[in-house]
């Protein structure tokens, strides 16, 4: 009956973790005798390809500096404990401690028996780092050039990890990678990028980072931060002021970053009512006359700069009952 | 401890059969495979073939193959070497050997001359 | 069947010297090889296996090398008790195979 090694093709193990080599010789057959199991490393340099052997009598062997005995051990292999008893090598996995990056490579086991001979399988063990990621909102002015809005950051993954964003606004990513602190790991870095509008002050986009260490993407939310001038309007007139109404008021309505600082209530005929009285964002009138046929401007300012809205009023001689009856407030 | 105790020195004639034997102790006797080896005088060493006795397989050297019986009895844990039609050339000091990762233990040695 | 040619096959050396035996497999046999040390009268003793492990008890001026046909035995400071025939053997594949001995003697 033939025997085959039993390994399994790929193998990942975390880096500074452990990672076991499965290795079994199969099936069981009476009478067929490992003599000796070794691992080697067939694409190391020549003083570093024997990594491993269990000699049934003399136990497990660690040749080479690199992994080295203290950080290689046989999982279930056994010596003989005495003359009257089997060593047992039918299992030899091979566990490997403190994974570094250097340990990525093929690895043979390898079971000399008799009498069938030599049998070998061959693993590829992969060493995997499992990213940190980050992401953050650059606090950025509102400009008429692209500038990175938000940073979304992998830190020391292997391999590389891989950057999207999720947004519904007009965008464009630009990526760098790096070299991590620990050795073979890479640190990406991708940065959202877009003309800075108040239009984006406020959103959240989403970093979505994939990596093969993670059961499913990473998503981190970041809220976007534009510093912009007041974006102005004005609201509360309904297009019913009449002669003696006392119940108006005009509302400046404003969209910043940051708060605004101050509010300037004024007209485009330099005349300004006395009966309108501006208090902050609201201008309130006490009694509507002639001097209110006129534009009202609110002027808004802030750290970053100002805004203005403008409002025609038409003062009409009685109230319109054919409106929807409407009182601005 | 291990131990392979093998018969004393023979002396045949060509043609004839000589049966060597080796008798173990200090371990499981079924449980590993009896191997037998050859040294002609100033010579190397040359594998003859092997007995299971745990159930009787046996494996030979295709070279004596025909002329070579490897067999053992576990009731006395002692393992025996046939070879038959004997020739000049089969003047050797053989041992029985017991593979324990490599030929670990060994047997004093028989000495077996073929001489007209 | 797979042939060990061993070289030299008479070696002579003062103590303290370096010595060097070779075996060359007539096919790949991984690193499936032995050497073994053979005194007068005695059966052999084994020295190296997995062409490059050392042996319980065996002293670490005696190293093996080498992997698929070619493999070397060391001696890095020759002792006068060192003085024996020392064999290769292959056991990748049945039937094992023996290299046809090197002796060494002291100078």
């Known amino acids: 009956q033939d025997v085959r090694v039993q390994v399994l093709p790929e193998v990942r193990g975390q880096l500074g973790g452990t990672v076991e080599l499965p290795c079994h010789l199969l099936p069981p057959v009476p009478g067929l005798y490992i003599s000796l199991v070794t691992w080697q490393r067939p694409d190391a340099p020549a003083n570093h390809q024997n990594v491993a052997a269990f000699h049934p009598k003399m136990g497990p062997s660690f040749p080479s500096p690199k992994p080295g005995s203290e950080r290689l051990s046989f999982v279930s292999a056994k010596q003989s404990t005495g003359q009257d008893t089997e060593a047992e090598l039918q299992d030899a996995t091979l566990a490997l401690h403190g994974l570094t990056v250097e340990d990525e490579g093929n690895y043979t086991c390898e079971f000399a028996t008799f009498p069938k001979g030599s049998v070998r399988g061959m693993t590829w063990l992969r060493v995997i780092a499992k990213p940190k990621n980050q992401a953050e909102a650059q606090k950025v002015t509102f400009s008429q050039d692209p500038t990175t809005v938000a940073l979304c950051i992998s830190k020391e993954g292997r391999p590389p990890a891989r950057i999207s964003w999720l947004s519904s606004l007009d965008w464009e990513a630009k990526e760098t990678q790096v070299s991590g602190t620990l050795a073979g790991t890479v640190t990406v870095t991708s940065r959202f990028t877009l003309v800075p509008s108040g239009r984006a002050d406020g959103v959240t986009v989403t970093c979505k980072v994939e990596h093969e260490s993670f059961e499913e993407p990473a998503l981190i939310p970041v809220t976007l931060s534009v510093r912009y001038p007041p974006e102005v309007s004005i609201s509360g007139y309904d297009d019913n002021w009449y002669l003696g109404r006392t119940d108006a008021t005009l509302s400046c309505d404003v969209r910043s970053n940051p708060e605004p600082t101050g509010y300037d209530w004024s007209t485009t005929s330099g005349t300004f009512p006395t009966s309108a009285v501006a208090q902050g964002s609201q201008l309130v009138i006490h009694a509507v006359d002639s001097l209110f046929n006129t534009t009202f401007v609110c002027t808004v300012t802030n750290a970053v700069g100002m805004g203005r809205a403008e409002q025609v009023i038409f003062v009409r001689e009685t109230p319109n009952t054919a409106g929807a009856g409407a009182t601005g407030g | 401890q291990v131990q392979l105790v093998q018969s004393g020195a023979e002396v045949k004639k060509p043609g004839s059969s000589v049966k060597v034997s080796c008798k173990a102790s200090?371990?499981?006797?079924?449980?590993?495979?009896i191997h037998w080896v050859r040294q002609p005088p100033g010579k190397g060493l040359e594998w003859i073939g092997a007995?299971?006795?745990?159930?009787?397989?046996?494996n030979y050297n295709q070279k004596f193959q025909g002329r070579v019986t490897i067999t053992a009895v576990t009731s006395t844990s002692t393992a025996y070497m046939e070879l038959s039609s004997l020739r000049s050339e089969d003047t050797a000091v053989y041992y029985c050997?017991?593979?324990?990762?490599?030929?670990?233990?060994w047997g004093q040695g028989t000495t077996v001359t073929v001489s007209s | 069947d797979i042939v060990m040619t061993q070289s030299p096959s008479t070696l002579s050396a003062s103590v303290g010297d370096r010595v060097s035996v070779t075996c060359k497999a007539s096919?790949?046999?991984?690193?499936?090889v032995v050497w073994y040390q053979q005194k007068p009268g005695q059966p052999p003793k084994t020295l190296i296996y997995?062409?490059?492990y050392r042996y319980s008890g065996v002293p670490d001026r005696f190293t093996g090398s080498g992997s698929g046909t070619d493999f070397t035995l060391t001696i890095s400071s020759l002792q006068a008790e060192d003085l024996a025939e020392y064999f290769c053997?292959?056991?990748?594949?049945?039937?094992?195979?023996f290299g046809q001995g090197t002796k060494l003697e002291i100078k």
């Open positions: 050997t017991k593979l324990v990762g490599t030929f670990d233990y």
């Open positions: 053997q292959q056991y990748n594949t049945n039937p094992f195979t």
């Open positions: 096919q790949n046999v991984g690193i499936n």
């Open positions: 200090g371990y499981i006797f079924t449980s590993y495979w």
């Open positions: 997995s062409a490059s």
């Open positions: 007995v299971y006795p745990g159930n009787s397989d046996s």
